[in-house]
Amino acid sequence: IPPHVPKSVNSDVMASDNGGAVKLPQLCKFCDVRLSTCDNQKSCMSNCSITAICEKPHEVCVAVWRKNDKNITLETVCHDPKLTYHGFTLEDAASPKCVMKEKKRAGETFFMCACNMEECNDYIIFSEEYTTSSPD
């Protein structure tokens, strides 16, 4: 533990996994659910102006894109990859990029991605071949 760091009661809040340094949680876009204009694009920006320090050091960035007959929404949050989100396991939680994967949901089109780089859920990718290009 670094000098003067108090002993933590809750180890989820303090991660010390290399040489005693304490790890800052990830920085993620965190706008919860917002209406989105992202549709039929290979990639999109979240248009979320809020970047939050995640609550726990092991949380990653998540984005959820949903389309139904009424609207399109994009959800941006932090989430623990050990826990499911919307009933689904967070795949590729260690990825530096947020590459959307379609999930089966009745009555809507549902894509979700997770990633573990600063603000990585700001740029969501629907085509894996498109990862090196700039957003539409």
Partner: nanobody
Framework: EVQLLESGGGLVQPGGSLRLSCAAS????????MAWVRQAPGKGLEWVSL????????YYANSVKGRFTISRDNSKNTLYLQMNSLRAEDTAVYYC????????????WGQGTLVTVSS
């Protein structure tokens, strides 16, 4: 030797304000990210706010966003946390922390300053 010395804590009523300071020495202050972290009684550490070397960007935990403001004066080697609209749940020991220069790791911490929000 790296030293971080927090001050400005105390007892304040709900809705009140406090300004914490952290005087830094022993390293090139204007080259490092700095953060405020707190520990409420019986709880784990909670990261409150982060600031980059030149003062921008700044980041906040959702629990304090819109109420707390982090800033720094590199000419004085000092980090600040302006806390407004304080709530009972903000009661904690507040620590300033220095970025290690690698990954997301912070390696030096102050002794802390106690903030008590109570009527």
């Amino acid at each position: 030797e790296v030293q971080l010395l927090e001050s400005g804590g105390g007892l304040v009523q709900p809705g009140g304000s406090l300004r914490l300071s952290c005087a830094a020495s022993g390293f090139t202050f204007d080259k490092y990210k700095m953060a405020w972290v707190r520990q409420a009684p019986g709880k784990g550490l909670e990261w409150v706010s982060l600031i980059f070397p030149n003062g921008v960007p700044t980041y906040y935990a959702n629990s304090v966003k819109g109420r707390f403001t982090i800033s720094r004066d590199n000419s004085k080697n000092t980090l600040y946390l302006q806390m407004n609209s304080l709530r009972a749940e903000d009661t904690a020991v507040y620590y300033c922390a220095k970025y290690s220069g690698q990954g997301r790791d912070f390696d030096y911490w102050g002794q802390g300053t106690l903030v008590t929000v109570s009527s």
